[in-house]
């Protein structure tokens, strides 16, 4: 037998995953190698990935994943029943939007089943880890000679989202920075017409309904200005291009969530 | 790119110890997804592993019972580097030693140039 | 522990030849194996990962196969410079990390 003894060495460190001695394997020690950390994040409030980085692992191992809200009326341990891999190796798990409640506190726990009492556990807030999709459908119209405003969509709850525009001509090397409330449009009050201006816009949920610090996705941009500002000098829109989401990555049809049952979840 | 750098005694008297150093270039040895191995080669047992280090969080080590009681592996954060100490060594212990790393999908990617240890009075 | 055992230990074979070097696990590794090319004086290097990844810059005339317990190396067209000994290690249940014994390759 050419089996392997792990130790620890020096005093400021751990004992490792196991140590094996003449013991039968039954009397084999809990491991102190830490499982890696699970990161969430709620997209859309549509679906929900949690994952972790299985190359943390010493050796290859699929790592389980089990969930539950506390002190809820979901606080039923449920297995997770769409992992996700990275080269053959559980790395993830997605949790559609039926398994998400955003205001209840979500328990997340890890085991190794090659030594199930190596497991840990997280509670984490949904509601500060929503991430919505970039914004949509952009469009620019002149207020005045020299006033333009710049409107939004979100594929979301608007009350529940502040947003970020960013602006700049084609001379600045920097963009301006502007944030906007929930009310998803902005007003430019001086413009001048010789230049070409580029907008773009990115949103986050917060702080109304959540405390998240993660934004969307830029939108894709939109310009205004040159030739085709004196084309039109009055009005002139034009929609950013769209950003499909597969019914893959959403994980099947998915249904946004009702701005009555965010208010109702929100307030409880 | 990383690179292995091994240094150290090539000869060792019998119940001595060995004692060699790895320096990493273009990795950390605290990388929390990589650990640092050593491994030696001789005629009569072919390639064998040794043991290896690892961080996550804290320090951990592996040691094969091929070598136990006698091995140390220690890494040194401030200098990017590894060692491996094997005491009270005897002419089994001769043979080339390397140093190497568990990269992607744990294959050893990167392995040092390798010492020849010959164990002599 | 987990043994290697690879097949033939040595092999002699001619330039532009197809060479077969086997390797076969005591349990099930899924595909947790590795190949390893070493020449004399110098350290192994990394042929092939999870049992058919080439490794980066490695020739694709290398290639590698088999899941469980049974894997392949395949080299298709030999070149000069494949004359070495070639090792398979497992990775799947570690420590201890194990390594077949090697098969000598040699020009004919």
């Known amino acids: 037998l050419n089996t392997t003894i792990l130790t620890p060495n020096g005093n400021e460190d751990a004992t490792t995953d196991f140590f094996l001695t003449s013991m039968p394997t039954d009397s084999l020690s809990v491991s102190t190698l830490p499982l890696p950390e699970v990161q969430c994040f709620v997209f859309n409030v549509e679906y929900m990935n949690c994952t972790w980085n299985s190359s943390s692992e010493p050796q290859p191992t699929n790592l389980t994943l089990h969930y539950w809200y506390k002190n809820s009326d979901n606080d039923k341990v449920q297995k997770c029943s769409h992992y996700l891999f990275s080269e053959e190796i559980t790395s993830g798990c997605q949790l559609q939007k039926k398994e998400i409640h955003l205001y209840q506190t979500f328990v997340v726990q890890l085991q190794d089943p090659r030594e199930p009492r190596r497991q840990a556990t997280q509670m984490l807030k949904l509601q500060n880890l929503v991430i919505p999709w970039a914004p949509e459908n952009l469009t620019l119209r002149k207020l005045s000679e020299s006033q333009l405003e710049l409107n939004w969509n979100n594929r979301f709850l608007n009350h529940c989202l502040e947003h970020l525009v960013q602006y700049r001509t084609d001379w600045d090397h920097s963009w301006t920075e502007q944030s906007v409330d929930y009310r998803h449009k902005f007003s430019l009050p001086s413009v001048d017409g010789q230049k070409r201006y580029t907008f773009r816009v990115r949103s986050r949920f917060n702080p109304l309904c959540g405390s998240a610090q993660h934004w969307s996705e830029w939108s894709h941009p939109i310009h205004w200005g040159s030739n085709s500002s004196k084309e039109n000098p009055f009005l002139f829109a034009l929609e950013a291009e769209q950003k499909l989401i597969s019914e893959e990555d959403l994980g099947g049809e998915q249904k946004l969530i009702s701005e009555e049952d965010l208010h109702h979840h929100h307030h409880h | 790119q990383v690179q292995l750098q091994q240094s150290g005694p090539g000869l060792v008297k019998p119940s001595q110890t060995l004692s060699l150093t790895c320096a990493i270039s273009?990795?950390?040895?605290?990388?929390?997804?990589a650990a640092w191995n050593w491994i030696r080669l001789s005629p009569s047992r072919g390639l064998e592993w040794l043991?290896?280090?690892?961080?996550?969080?804290?320090?951990?080590?592996d040691y094969s019972l091929s070598v136990k009681g006698r091995i140390t592996i220690n890494p040194d954060t401030s200098k990017n580097q590894f060692s491996l100490h094997l005491n009270s060594v005897t002419p089994e212990d001769a043979a080339v030693y390397y140093c190497?790393?568990?990269?992607?999908?744990?294959?050893?990617?990167?392995w040092g140039q390798g010492t020849l240890v010959t164990v002599s009075s | 522990d987990i043994q290697m055992t690879q097949s033939p230990s040595s092999l002699s074979a001619s330039v532009g030849d197809r060479v077969t070097i086997t390797c076969r696990a005591s349990?099930?590794?899924?595909?947790?194996l590795n190949w390893y090319q070493q020449k004399p004086g110098k350290a192994p290097k990394l042929l092939i990962y999870?049992?058919?990844s080439l490794q980066s810059g490695v020739p694709s005339r290398f290639s590698g196969s088999g899941s469980g317990t049974d894997f392949t190396l395949t080299i298709s067209s030999l070149q000069p410079e494949d004359f070495a000994t070639y090792y398979c290690?497992?990775?799947?249940?570690?420590?201890?990390?194990?390594f077949g014994q090697g098969t000598r390759l040699e020009i004919k």
């Open positions: 349990q099930s590794i899924s595909s947790y």
């Open positions: 290690q497992q990775s799947y249940s570690t420590p201890p990390i194990t």
């Open positions: 190497a790393r568990t990269g992607r999908r744990w294959s050893l990617d990167y």
């Open positions: 273009g990795d950390s040895v605290s990388s929390n997804i």
């Open positions: 999870a049992a058919s």
């Open positions: 043991g290896r280090t690892f961080f996550r969080s804290t320090w951990f080590y």
